[in-house]
Interface confidence: medium
Amino acid sequence: MASLSRPSLPSCLCSFLLLLLLQVSSSYAGQFRVIGPRHPIRALVGDEVELPCRISPGKNATGMEVGWYRPPFSRVVHLYRNGKDQDGDQAPEYRGRTELLKDAIGEGKVTLRIRNVRFSDEGGFTCFFRDHSYQEEAAMELKVEDPFYWVSPGVLVLLAVLPVLLLQITVGLIFLCLQYRLRGKLRAEIENLHRTFDPHFLRVPCWKITLFVIVPVLGPLVALIICYNWLHRRLAGQFLEELRNPF
C-alpha cells in the first residue's frame, strides 16, 4: 500500500529537483549530432563552392561557436564565435575567400561558401558546433576539378584542327582543280600556237604548297597549344602560389 500513498513534501521536492537537473544537464550533455554531406562535394577551379553543415535535432545555433577546420594540423578555414566571424583566426590561404551563410542558423543549419576555389582546397574539411564545453563535428570532402579536365592537349588539338584541316583540304582540292583547268586551257592555247609545252611550267611551286596548306594548318595548331598551356598555367598558378605554404 505504501507505494500508492502520497509522497511526502521533501521527496516530492527531491524528485522535482532531480528532473530539473536532468533537464538542465541534457542541454549541455550532447543532445545534438553534426551532420555534413555524406558524398564528396565537387567544384571547379575558380568557381565558388558551398559546404553545408547542420545539427540534429535542429536548434538555434546563434549562440554557439561554429567553424570549419582542415587537416593537417587543424588550420582554421572559418570561425564564427560570439555572433561574429573571427577573421583573425583564419589560415592565411582562406582569408577573404570564405563566407558563412547564416540564414538558417536559427534552425541549426549553416553553409560555408568558399570563393575562387583552388586545387589546394581539395581534401577533407571538418565542420564543428560548440555549445559551451560540448563539441560535435562532422567530416566532409571537397573534390576540385579542372574545368578542362576532359580536354587533354591531344583532344583539344584534334577538336580544333580537324575542321581547319578539312577546310584546308577542301581549299587545296579547289585550288588544284582550278590549276588543272587553267593548265588545260593554257595547253590548248599553246598547242594552237604550236609551241613546245614544258610540263613543269605550271607545276605548283613547293613554297606555295607550304604557304597555303601547311602554314594555315600548323598556325592554329601552335596557337591552340600555346593557348591551352597558358590556360593550364593560369589555373595551376592558383595552386602553385601557395603550394609551399602548407599551413
Epitope: F73, S120, E122
Partner: antibody, heavy 122, light 110 residues
Framework: QVQLVQSGGGVVQPGRSLRLSCAAS????????MHWVRQAPGKGLEWVAV????????YYADSVKGRFTISRDNSKNTLYLQMNSLRAEDTAVYYC???????????????WGQGTLVTVSS | QSALTQPASVSGSPGQSITISCTGT?????????VSWYQQHPGKAPKLMIY???ERPSGVSNRFSGSKSGNTASLTISGLQAEDEADYYC??????????FGGGTKLTVL
C-alpha cells in the same frame, strides 16, 4: 642545393635546458613548414614538433608539450628548438626536416638535417 | 602517442619483391591519405621514398611503390637489390594535430 645544417647538441643534466638550431639554405625558408623529429639510440623515429611557414601555428607531441618550444627566424633562415626540463628519455638524435606537403598530400619530409645528438645524463 | 604497427623485420633475396605493412587506426592511416615512407641507412638521416600513400618523389626508383587499404598502408619493393637493405619507417598524420611514425622495419637482403 637545399641544406639543413644543425647545431647545439651536447650533454646536459636532467632538468636543464638546451637550444638546438637548424640553419637552412638553398631554398625559400619562409615558404615552408618545418619539423623536429628525434630518434633515441637504437630506436625508431618520433615526431616532436612542427611550426608553420610564418611561425603562427605550432604543434607538439604529447611527450614534449609544455617543455619544448619550436620557433623560427625567417630573416636568419633558422629554425630553433628550445628544450627545457630535460629528462633522460629525451636522449636522442634530433633532426630538423623540411615539410614539402600541402593540403592534399599531408605533411612529408623531403629534406633532413644531418642530426644532432642530445644526451641527458647526470 | 602510440606508434603505427610495422613488422620488426622483413627479408628477401635479390630480385624478389617484398611488402612492409603499416597498421594504424581510422584516426591516422585510415582517416587520411597522408602516409609517407622513409628509408634510413645506419648512421644516416632518413630519406623520403613515398608520400601521400603512393606518390614517388623524383629520384626514387620505380621499384618502390605504396598503397593503402583501410587502416593499413603498405610499401612494396620489387626487384630487391643489396642497397635496399635498411630500416623503413611509415608515417601518418593523426587527427588532433599530431604526426606519428611506425616502429620501423629492418629489411635484410639475403
Amino acid at each position: 642545393q637545399v641544406q639543413l645544417v644543425q647545431s647545439g647538441g651536447g650533454v646536459v643534466q636532467p632538468g636543464r635546458s638546451l637550444r638546438l638550431s637548424c640553419a637552412a639554405s638553398g631554398f625559400t625558408f619562409s615558404s615552408y613548414a618545418m619539423h623536429w623529429v628525434r630518434q633515441a639510440p637504437g630506436k625508431g623515429l618520433e615526431w616532436v614538433a612542427v611550426i608553420s611557414y610564418d611561425g603562427s601555428n605550432k604543434y607538439y607531441a604529447d611527450s614534449v608539450k609544455g617543455r619544448f618550444t619550436i620557433s623560427r627566424d625567417n630573416s636568419k633562415n633558422t629554425l630553433y628548438l628550445q628544450m627545457n626540463s630535460l629528462r633522460a628519455e629525451d636522449t636522442a638524435v634530433y633532426y630538423c626536416a623540411r615539410d614539402a606537403g600541402g593540403d592534399s598530400s599531408g605533411p612529408y619530409f623531403d629534406y633532413w638535417g644531418q642530426g644532432t645528438l642530445v644526451t641527458v645524463s647526470s | 602517442q602510440s606508434a603505427l604497427t610495422q613488422p620488426a623485420s622483413v627479408s628477401g633475396s635479390p630480385g624478389q619483391s617484398i611488402t612492409i605493412s603499416c597498421t594504424g587506426t581510422s584516426s591516422d592511416v585510415g582517416g587520411y591519405n597522408f602516409v609517407s615512407w622513409y628509408q634510413q641507412h645506419p648512421g644516416k638521416a632518413p630519406k623520403l621514398m613515398i608520400y601521400a600513400v603512393s606518390e614517388r618523389p623524383s629520384g626514387v626508383s620505380n621499384r618502390f611503390s605504396g598503397s593503402k587499404s583501410g587502416n593499413t598502408a603498405s610499401l612494396t619493393i620489387s626487384g630487391l637489390q643489396a642497397e635496399d637493405e635498411a630500416d623503413y619507417y611509415c608515417s601518418s598524420y593523426r587527427s588532433r594535430d599530431a604526426l606519428v611514425f611506425g616502429g620501423g622495419t629492418k629489411l635484410t637482403v639475403l
